[in-house]
């Protein structure tokens, strides 16, 4: 037997950007409290699975009211340790969940409104009797600093609290076969004597003189196997030879307890032990209240303390469902316009916009030409989130800053020679061709292939085209 102890040092905003808002306001002052849940082993268990090693709730911290405009500081904490007693051996490896809860102190419905601010979890190895272990855990934008240890309750000692110690009977040494109890050198290890004859394989004891059976075994010395088959006898005392325990018609047959309640027989009838959130003779009445902490993912629980009261969970962005248990894929609604990329950050939605678009949802089409000058007489043309310059003759490049070589594209057809000119280019045509780009063949009879002669000229008159 022993006690797991948890000391919370601080709870406040973690390092880095995105400091959380203070959980309390001037209108609704609040205070913090903590819950710790311990489970044996290193298994990754759901937060809702039982706290098999035990659980504890802290006292309420001092009332805190936010200073308007101030960032959330480290919040005032409850006094004292959280202590989780354990009856059996300390397992050495354990999983923990530490929850930080906010209790509002406004004009409440019938009980305080509670909401889970942060939940941290981890798996650790820890020997009982060792020093305090320090830890820092982050949950979203919050940071929790704490220390923990496991210590044995006398007379238990050892890394698992399974050895028992007694004060020495003789001042000099311990009895035959018994060692001194480190670190209590003035005490001796005490033999744990179970009931005489208790099966060493199937029985064990936590107190001297007892004999407790492992599952599947029965009898005063745990030597009789429990079998529910190969038994022909009716309901009644178990057979000493076979150990058969055949259930007959009893008040708990068929389990009359609803909603996962467990049934135990009483002298007159039966009794249901109901799970959290249910009550009534057969656990048939649902009575979840905010005290049961039904809201997940930082949801705020609002409702009365009476089991008949309704409750509602006010959900933070990104969660939905009656208990805020479902994550919303907000990007599936395609909120980002103009081809923007949607990012769901949990606490907020972000749109990464394509070039030329801006705004929370990329809804603003930027004036691509605003502040964009095209040099050398070029004109800016908008389109598709990017700007383009239509350059004046003789210039090129993105901003018309480059002097273009008009002959680079070989604009003169049929072997014409190209000459750069201040106003553009000039083609000197090869014999038999004419036109600004030497594109027209001259017919042998002196007429050109032009569809019609320019006004004032007769076909066959000499023409000159540059």
């Amino acid at each position: 037997a022993g006690v797991f102890e948890l000391q919370i040092h601080s709870f406040g905003p973690g390092p880095g950007p995105g400091a959380p808002r203070s959980p309390c306001s001037a209108r609704l002052p609040c205070r913090l409290f903590f819950r710790v849940c311990l489970k044996p082993g290193l298994s990754e268990e759901a937060a809702e699975s039982p706290c098999a090693l035990g659980a504890a709730l802290s006292a309420r911290g001092p009332v805190y009211t936010e200073q308007p405009g101030a960032p959330a500081p480290d919040l005032p904490l409850p006094d004292g340790l959280l202590q989780v007693p354990f009856r059996d051996a300390w397992p050495g490896t354990f999983s923990f969940i530490i929850e930080t809860w906010r209790e509002e102190l406004g004009d409440q419905i019938g009980g305080p409104a509670w909401s889970l601010l942060a939940r941290v979890a981890g798996r650790r190895r820890l020997a009982a009797g060792g020093p305090w272990a320090r830890d820092i855990q982050r949950a979203g934008a919050w940071e929790l600093r704490f220390s923990y240890r496991a210590r044995c309750e006398p007379p238990a000692v050892g890394t698992a609290c399974t050895r028992l110690c007694r004060p020495r009977s003789a001042p000099s040494r311990c009895g035959p076969g018994l060692r001194p109890c480190a670190p209590l050198e003035d005490e001796c290890e005490a033999p744990l004597v179970c009931r005489a004859g208790c099966s060493p394989e199937h029985g064990f004891c936590e107190q001297p003189g007892e004999c407790r059976c492992l599952e599947g075994w029965t009898g005063p010395l745990c030597t009789v196997p429990v079998s529910t088959s190969s038994c022909l006898s009716p309901r009644g005392p178990s057979s000493a030879t076979t150990g058969c325990l055949v259930p007959g018609p009893g008040p708990c047959d068929g389990n009359p307890c609803a909603n996962g309640g467990s049934c135990s027989e009483t002298p007159r009838s039966f009794e249901c032990t109901c799970p959290r959130g249910f009550y009534g003779l057969r656990c048939e009445v649902s009575g979840v209240t905010c005290a049961d902490g039904p809201c997940f993912n930082g949801g705020l629980c609002v409702g009365g303390a009476d089991p008949d009261s309704a409750y509602i969970c006010h959900c933070p962005p990104g969660f939905q469902g009656s208990n805020c248990e479902k994550r919303v894929d907000r990007c599936s609604l395609q909120p980002c316009r103009n081809g923007g990329l949607c990012l769901d950050l949990g606490h907020a939605l972000r749109c990464r916009c394509r070039a030329g678009f801006a705004g929370p949802r990329c809804e603003h089409d930027l004036d691509d030409c605003a502040g964009r000058a095209c040099a050398n007489g070029g004109t800016c043309v908008e389109g598709g989130g990017a700007h383009r310059c239509s350059c004046a003759l003789g210039f090129g490049g993105r901003d018309c800053r480059e002097r273009a070589d008009p002959c680079a594209a070989r604009p003169c057809a049929h072997g014409g020679r190209c000459y750069a000119h201040f106003s553009g280019l000039v083609c000197a045509c090869a014999p038999g061709y004419m036109g600004a780009r030497c594109e027209f063949p001259v017919h042998p009879d002196g007429a050109s292939a032009l569809p019609a002669a320019p006004p004032g000229l007769r076909p066959g008159d000499p023409q000159r085209y540059l």
């Epitope: 306001s25 209108r27 609704l28 406004g106 004009d107 419905i109 409104a113 705020l300 609002v302 509602i312 969970c313 006010h314 959900c315 933070p316 969660f319 939905q320 469902g321 009656s322 805020c324």
Partner: nanobody, 115 residues
């Protein structure tokens, strides 16, 4: 300070019906959780019915199947349709709204169920 205003209360016989309204008010927006809270003489306040900001409804065990809560976001109004009324439903009914930072209450409307 903006307050919620309830209407529709009154005296009714057992088995009768009433419809309570709250609003219109700029407080009653889709990002708020809203509900109806009642307080019988000598008893504590209890949430009878509520609609969360994500649209989930919940009812007190004693009114399930008899009361229906609804909201009209366009009209900024919340309603409570009460039928098959019983003597134990006699109470002052308050309209309630809240978000993470604030909570809002109405002055209450009295519902009396008596033969």
């Amino acid at each position: 300070e903006v307050q919620l205003v309830e209407s529709g209360g009154g005296e009714v016989q057992p088995g009768g019906s009433l419809r309570l309204s709250c609003g219109p008010s700029e407080i009653i927006t889709s990002d708020k959780s809203v509900g109806w809270v009642r307080q019988a003489p000598g008893k504590q306040r209890n949430l009878v019915a509520g609609i969360s900001n994500v649209g989930s409804t919940n009812y007190a065990q004693s009114v399930k199947g008899r009361f229906t809560i609804s909201r009209d976001n366009a009209k900024n109004t919340v309603y409570l349709q009460m039928s098959s009324l019983r003597a134990e439903d006699t109470a002052v009914y308050y309209c309630y709204a809240r978000d993470f930072e604030n909570e809002y209450w109405g002055q209450g409307t009295l519902v009396t169920v008596k033969p």
